[in-house]
């Protein structure tokens, strides 16, 4: 079970974009081409932004997450990649408290980026109301940031 106390809740994002740091037995069964990853990210980006904007507008007064400089990208020269397995449990956890239909679309896209043999982390919501809102906000903010980092890297790398 991942802890949601303090910064530990962001453990998910340490693996967010680092396919290249994972051992070979965790690699996806079908390695996606950069063009495929870019296409998925371009589909995810407006959904992620929309969810974040909706949530911020509804939850006025929540502080901005100060965990913006996460090691989202691999420093390796290979293709940076979103680890769908690491992120999926978080979106599954927040679905009942968010826009069901948009989350479903995000889950479908993340599933394409899933590492087949990697066990999924178990994620539960913080019980405290304020903590829970912060948790959802942080997931949405960090996911949006992660997508931007990967897209930037893909665009600047070899096409």
């Amino acid at each position: 079970m991942l802890s949601h106390a303090g910064p530990a809740r962001f453990a998910l994002f340490l693996l967010c974009c680092m396919e290249t740091l994972l051992p070979s037995h965790m690699a996806p069964t079908h390695r996606l081409q950069p063009s495929d990853v870019r296409k998925i990210i371009l589909e995810l980006r407006p959904m992620s932004k929309g969810l974040l904007q909706d949530y911020v507008s509804k939850e006025i007064g929540l502080p901005e997450s100060n965990h913006s400089s996460l090691p989202c990208l691999s420093s390796d020269s290979q293709l940076p990649h979103i680890n769908g397995s690491a992120i999926l449990p978080y979106f599954r956890a927040i679905r009942p408290l968010s826009d069901k239909n948009t989350i479903d679309k995000i889950i479908e896209q993340l599933d394409k980026l899933k590492f087949q043999r990697e066990p999924e982390a178990e994620v539960s919501m913080p019980a405290d109301n304020f903590e829970r809102k912060n948790f959802i906000l942080a997931v949405l903010q960090q996911f949006s940031a992660c997508l931007e980092h990967v897209l930037q890297s893909l665009n600047s790398g070899p096409q």
Epitope: F91, R92, A93, R95, P96, K100, D104, D111, N129
Partner: antibody, heavy 121, light 106 residues
């Protein structure tokens, strides 16, 4: 698009068992609960239980405990509902329906077409 | 288990009418700041269809004349301007606690 396709109608004798399937497509099968419900003729909806295909976890309505078994086959994206010791009161339309993705139960947004089970001697 | 009571049990109305159906739960269905109350429509001989989820969210593809409100134990489904195709049975359902339970239908 999301589709839940159920097996056809069944006629069973009292005391027998029935096994119905629900084949899912168009979404990531292992991340969503599948609920089973039934509706007797001219009656309301009754929830029977759910299964989470990702780990095979189940929860049954006490009304059906001991008679109901839910199983999932992730290789074929199919969920099975088996009801044993059938009686005439079990005559109903049986539905599968997709639920939520977490321990927090959610609405059932996609439904199978239903499978009519008739129990008669 | 949470008991769900709908009222009225049946009603007759004309096209263009504003229709309200209420649902009362025997205990609160709120959790995490959200009401886990949902509304379904079932036309004769057809499969139930999700209309409103979590008290007030309109399901994708459902006409905007349908709306839901309420929290805690008391909930309402409103059809702002009735259409002939709205003739159906409407069910409320809670998902806050197992067993999941439905109202008897309107």
């Amino acid at each position: 698009q999301v589709l839940l396709v159920q097996s056809g109608a069944e006629v069973k004798k009292p005391g027998a068992s029935v096994k119905i399937f629900c084949k899912a497509s168009g979404y990531s099968f292992t991340y969503y609960d599948i609920n089973w419900l039934r509706q007797a003729p001219e009656q309301g909806l009754e929830w029977m239980g759910w299964i989470f295909p990702g780990d095979g976890g189940t929860k049954y309505n006490e009304t059906f405990k001991g008679r109901l078994t839910l199983t999932a086959d992730t290789s074929t994206n199919t969920v099975y509902m088996e009801l044993s010791s059938l009686r005439s009161a079990d005559t109903a339309m049986y539905y599968c329906a997709r639920g939520g993705t977490s321990v927090i139960r959610d609405a059932m947004d996609y439904w199978g077409q239903g499978a009519l089970v008739t129990v008669s001697s | 288990e949470i008991q769900m009571t709908q009222s009225p049990s049946s009603l007759s109305a004309s096209p263009g009418d504003r229709v309200t159906i209420t649902c009362r739960a025997s205990e609160s269905v709120d959790n995490y700041g959200i009401s886990f109350m949902h509304w379904y429509q079932q036309k004769p001989g057809k499969v139930p269809k999700l209309l409103i989820y979590r008290a007030s969210n309109l399901e994708s593809g459902v006409p905007s004349r349908f709306s839901g409100s309420g929290s805690g134990t008391d909930f309402t489904l409103t059809i702002s301007s009735l259409e002939p195709e709205d003739a159906a049975t409407y069910y409320c359902q809670q998902s806050n606690k197992d067993p999941l339970t439905f109202g008897q239908g309107t």
